[in-house]
C-alpha cells in the first residue's frame, strides 16, 4: 500500500533558530520515511533531507527573512512514493520569537509605568507589536493592552496610584501570526499621591431638650482608593449654615469623631493627609433638628443569591447617584460601634458576602439617599444572611375543647430564638392509636381551630415553627375531647 499523501503542512519559523514544519498523518501504520525539500533564497537554493517522523527542522541558514520559502514532503515506503502539494511560507508571517526580557519597570507620574524591554533575538528593525498584561497583586483578572509599532520602551497609563501591579509583556512581528510567550512577570508599585477623598457618614443621636445633639462622624477609605494608601491623619472642619464661624479639628488619628452640634443645620467636611498633601474634602450636611428630610426610595427588598445577600431598591428620582447602606444586628444595644456602613454609587443595589454577616441573626438594613451633600430619609428592612431552624418550637396551649373541636394557641417564638423569618406554623395532631394529621397556617396566625375530632378521645398535639431552613417542633401536649 502506498503511503498516505502528506497533508496539512504547517511551518513555524523560530526566529533566527530554525524553520520547523509538521504534517499529517502523524503516525503511519507501515514503515514510512520522508524526504523534505525546502526551496529558499527566492527560489534560487534547495535543501533536502530525510525525516523519519512527520516533523522536520530546517537549519537557520535556510531561513532568512524576508524570504518566501516553499516546502514539499515526499512520503515513501516499500510500495512507492507520494508527494505532498507544495506549500509556500512567507517567513516573517510565521515567525515566532522567544519571550522578551523586561529590563526595567519605572513608575513615572502618579498612575503610569514606563517599561523598558528587549527581545532575546535581534529583531533587525522588523516592525513589532507588543502586548502588555497587568493586574493588581490581589486580583486574578488580567487587563491586556496592545501597542502597535512598539519600540523597546512603552508607557502603561491609566493605572491607580500607589498600587502594586503584576505585569508581563509579549510581542510579535507586525506581520506575524504568532505571539511570543509572556515574559517573566514583574511586580511594581505606582507612585503615591495625595489620599483619595474619603467616604463620610454620620450617626445622629436624638436632640436633647435644648435642641443640641451628638453627631458621631464616621469615615473610611473609599472603595476605589489604592490598597496601599497610607494616611498620617485627618482634619475636620464644620460650621453652622447661618454662621461664618468655622471650627477646625486637626490631626485626628481615629476614623470616627463625636461632635456636639446645636439644633441648626451644619456642614461638615473631613480630609485625610499624607506626606504629599491632603485629599479633597468629603462633605456631609447635618440637617436642622426640625427639618423634614426627603423620601426618595419607593420600595426595597432583600434576597439571597448564593453566596451573596442582595438588597435592591427603587428610587423615585434618577438624580440620586449615591446611597449609604447601613446594616446592624437587630439585637445591638446601640448603633455605635455595632453599625456597619458603605457608600454605593451609580446603582440601586448592594451586595455583601453572606459569610461577612453573622448567620441566624436578624439585621436591620437601611438605605439613605444622598443628593449633593444632603442626606434623605432612609428606607429600612430586615434580613438574614443565613437562616437556620428555630432554636425552639412554639409554646403551645389547648383552649375551647369541645366534643369534636379544639383551639390550639401558641406564643410567638422570641426573636433571639427564631434563626430566620418564620414562614408558617404546622399544627400536628394525633388521636391515640390513630394516624398523624396536620394543618399549616401562615406566620401571622398564633392559633388554629381543629375540627372533625372524635368525641371522648385522647389527642397529642404539637406545633412546628418553620423558617426557610426547616422547622422545629414545640413540646407535645395532650388533651381529650368531651363526651
Amino acid at each position: 500500500v502506498l503511503p498516505t499523501k502528506p497533508e496539512n503542512i504547517s511551518c513555524v519559523f523560530y526566529f533566527d533558530r530554525n524553520l520547523t514544519c509538521t504534517w499529517r498523518p502523524e503516525k503511519e501504520t507501515n514503515d514510512t520515511s520522508y524526504i523534505v525539500t525546502l526551496t529558499y533564497s527566492y527560489g534560487k537554493s534547495n535543501y533536502s533531507d530525510n525525516a523519519t517522523e512527520a516533523s522536520y527542522s530546517f537549519p537557520r541558514s535556510c531561513a532568512m527573512p524576508p524570504d518566501i520559502c516553499s516546502v514539499e514532503v515526499q512520503a515513501q515506503n516499500g510500495d512507492g512514493k507520494v508527494k505532498s502539494d507544495i506549500t509556500y511560507w512567507h517567513l516573517i508571517s510565521i515567525a515566532k520569537t522567544e519571550p522578551p526580557i523586561i529590563l526595567s519597570v519605572n513608575p513615572i507620574c502618579n498612575r503610569m509605568f514606563q517599561i523598558q524591554w528587549k527581545p532575546r533575538e535581534k529583531t533587525r528593525g522588523f516592525p513589532l507589536v507588543c502586548m502588555l498584561r497587568f493586574r493588581t497583586v490581589n486580583s486574578s483578572h488580567w487587563t491586556e493592552v496592545n501597542f502597535e509599532n512598539c519600540k523597546q520602551v512603552c508607557n502603561l497609563t491609566g493605572l491607580q496610584a500607589f498600587t502594586e501591579y503584576v505585569l508581563a509583556l509579549r510581542f510579535r512581528f507586525n506581520d506575524s501570526r504568532y505571539w511570543s510567550k509572556w515574559s517573566k512577570e514583574e511586580t511594581r508599585v505606582t507612585m503615591e499621591e495625595v489620599p483619595h477623598v474619603l467616604d463620610l457618614w454620620r450617626i445622629l443621636e436624638p436632640a436633647d431638650m435644648n435642641g443640641d445633639r451628638k453627631v458621631r462622624l464616621l469615615w473610611k477609605k473609599a472603595r476605589g482608593a489604592p490598597v496601599l494608601e497610607k494616611t498620617f491623619g485627618y482634619h475636620i472642619q464644620y460650621f453652622a449654615e447661618n454662621s461664618t464661624n468655622l471650627t477646625e479639628i486637626n490631626n485626628i488619628t481615629t476614623q470616627q469623631y463625636e461632635l456636639l452640634l446645636m439644633s441648626q443645620a451644619h456642614s461638615v467636611s473631613v480630609t485625610s493627609f499624607n506626606s504629599l498633601g491632603k485629599s479633597q474634602e468629603a462633605i456631609l450636611r447635618i440637617p436642622d433638628v426640625h427639618e423634614k428630610t426627603f423620601q426618595y426610595i419607593k420600595s426595597m427588598k432583600a434576597y439571597i443569591a448564593e453566596p451573596l445577600l442582595v438588597v435592591n431598591w427603587q428610587s423615585s428620582i434618577p438624580a440620586v447617584d449615591t446611597w449609604i447602606v447601613e446594616w446592624l444586628p437587630e439585637a445591638a444595644m446601640s448603633k455605635f460601634p455595632a453599625l456597619s456602613w458603605e457608600s454605593v454609587s451609580q446603582v440601586t443595589n448592594w451586595t455583601i458576602e453572606q459569610d461577612k454577616l453573622k448567620p441566624f441573626t436578624c439585621y436591620n438594613i437601611s438605605v439613605y439617599p444622598v443628593l449633593g451633600h444632603r442626606v434623605g430619609e432612609p428606607y429600612s428592612i430586615q434580613a438574614y444572611a443565613k437562616e437556620g431552624t428555630p432554636l425552639k418550637g412554639p409554646e403551645t396551649r389547648v383552649e375551647n375543647i369541645g366534643l369534636r373541636t379544639a383551639t390550639i394557641t401558641w406564643k410567638e417564638i422570641p426573636k433571639s430564638a427564631r434563626n430566620g423569618f418564620i414562614n408558617n406554623y404546622t399544627v400536628f395532631y394525633q388521636a391515640e392509636g390513630g394516624k398523624e394529621l396536620s394543618k399549616t397556617v401562615n406566620s401571622h396566625a398564633l392559633q388554629c381551630d381543629l375540627e372533625s375530632l372524635t368525641r371522648r378521645t385522647s389527642y397529642t398535639v404539637w406545633v412546628m415553627a418553620s423558617t426557610r431552613a426547616g422547622g422545629t417542633n414545640g413540646v407535645r401536649i395532650n388533651f381529650k375531647t368531651l363526651s
Partner: antibody
C-alpha cells in the same frame, strides 16, 4: 552585481560619500554591508543596512559613518576623515535580509586621505 | 567591542594536507553561531566560504568545513590545493551589532 564608486583622494576633515550601485536583485530583499581594508591590513566591518532600512554600525564607526539607501543604491557618508581612514571600501550583499553571510562583493573603491 | 583572535598566522601546508584555523571570540556570538569565514586573495574582494559557523556557501568545495559554537570556531581545509593559498578571515556577529568585527586574518601558504 555590486559596484562601488566615489573613492578619491581627499584632505583630512573633508566629508565624502561613497555609492554602491546594485543590479540583478532588489535591495528590499537583502541586507547590504560596508567593509574596508587599509593597505596591507585586514578587513574591518563598518556597518549594515537591512532589507527593511534599519542600519547598524560598528561602535568605532558610529557618528562618523552613515549608511542609507535608495531603491538601487547604497550610500556610505563619511565625515571628519583622517589619514587612518585611507582604505579600499567594499560594498557587499548578504544572504537574506539581515545576515552577516556576505556573499556578493563589489571590487572595492579606494579612498586616500592625505594632506 | 568584541575581539576575534585568529591563530596561527601564517600557517603553511603541503598540497593534499590539512589546515586548521582557529577563531576565538572575546564573547559569545549571537545565537552561538553567527560566524562567517571568508577567503581573500591579493587584489580581490573577499569570498564567503562558511556562514552560521558550519554552513557551506553556495559553490564552495566541500573540503572547506566550519565548526564550533559560542566563542570557539574552527575552519578546516582538508586536501589542500594550491588555489587555497590566501588570507582567511572570520567575522562574528553579536547581540549588539555595534560589536560585530572581523578577526585579524590568517595567511595560508601552500607548499
Amino acid at each position: 552585481s555590486v559596484e562601488e564608486s566615489g573613492g578619491r583622494l581627499v584632505t583630512p576633515g573633508t566629508p565624502l560619500t561613497l555609492t554602491c550601485t546594485v543590479s540583478g536583485f532588489s535591495l528590499s530583499n537583502y541586507a547590504m554591508s560596508w567593509v574596508r581594508q587599509a593597505p596591507g591590513k585586514g578587513l574591518e566591518w563598518i556597518g549594515i543596512i537591512t532589507y527593511g532600512d534599519t542600519t547598524y554600525s560598528a561602535s568605532w564607526a558610529k557618528g562618523r559613518f552613515t549608511i542609507s539607501k535608495t531603491s538601487t543604491t547604497v550610500d556610505l557618508k563619511m565625515t571628519s576623515l583622517t589619514t587612518e581612514d585611507t582604505a579600499t571600501y567594499f560594498c557587499a550583499r548578504s544572504y537574506g535580509g539581515y545576515s552577516l553571510a556576505i556573499s556578493l562583493w563589489g571590487p572595492g573603491t579606494l579612498v586616500t586621505v592625505s594632506s | 567591542a568584541a575581539v576575534l583572535t585568529q591563530t596561527p598566522s601564517p600557517v603553511s601546508a603541503a598540497v593534499g594536507g590539512t589546515v586548521t584555523i582557529n577563531c576565538q571570540s572575546s564573547q559569545s556570538v549571537y545565537m552561538n553561531n553567527e560566524l562567517s569565514w571568508f577567503q581573500q586573495k591579493p587584489g580581490q574582494p573577499p569570498k564567503l566560504l562558511i556562514y552560521y559557523a558550519a554552513t557551506l556557501a553556495s559553490g564552495v568545495p566541500s573540503r572547506f568545513k566550519g565548526s564550533g559554537s559560542g566563542t570557539e570556531f574552527t575552519l578546516t581545509i582538508s586536501g589542500v590545493q594550491c588555489d587555497d593559498a590566501a588570507t582567511y578571515y572570520c567575522l562574528g556577529g553579536y547581540d549588539d551589532d555595534a560589536d560585530n568585527a572581523f578577526g585579524g586574518g590568517t595567511e595560508v601558504v601552500v607548499k
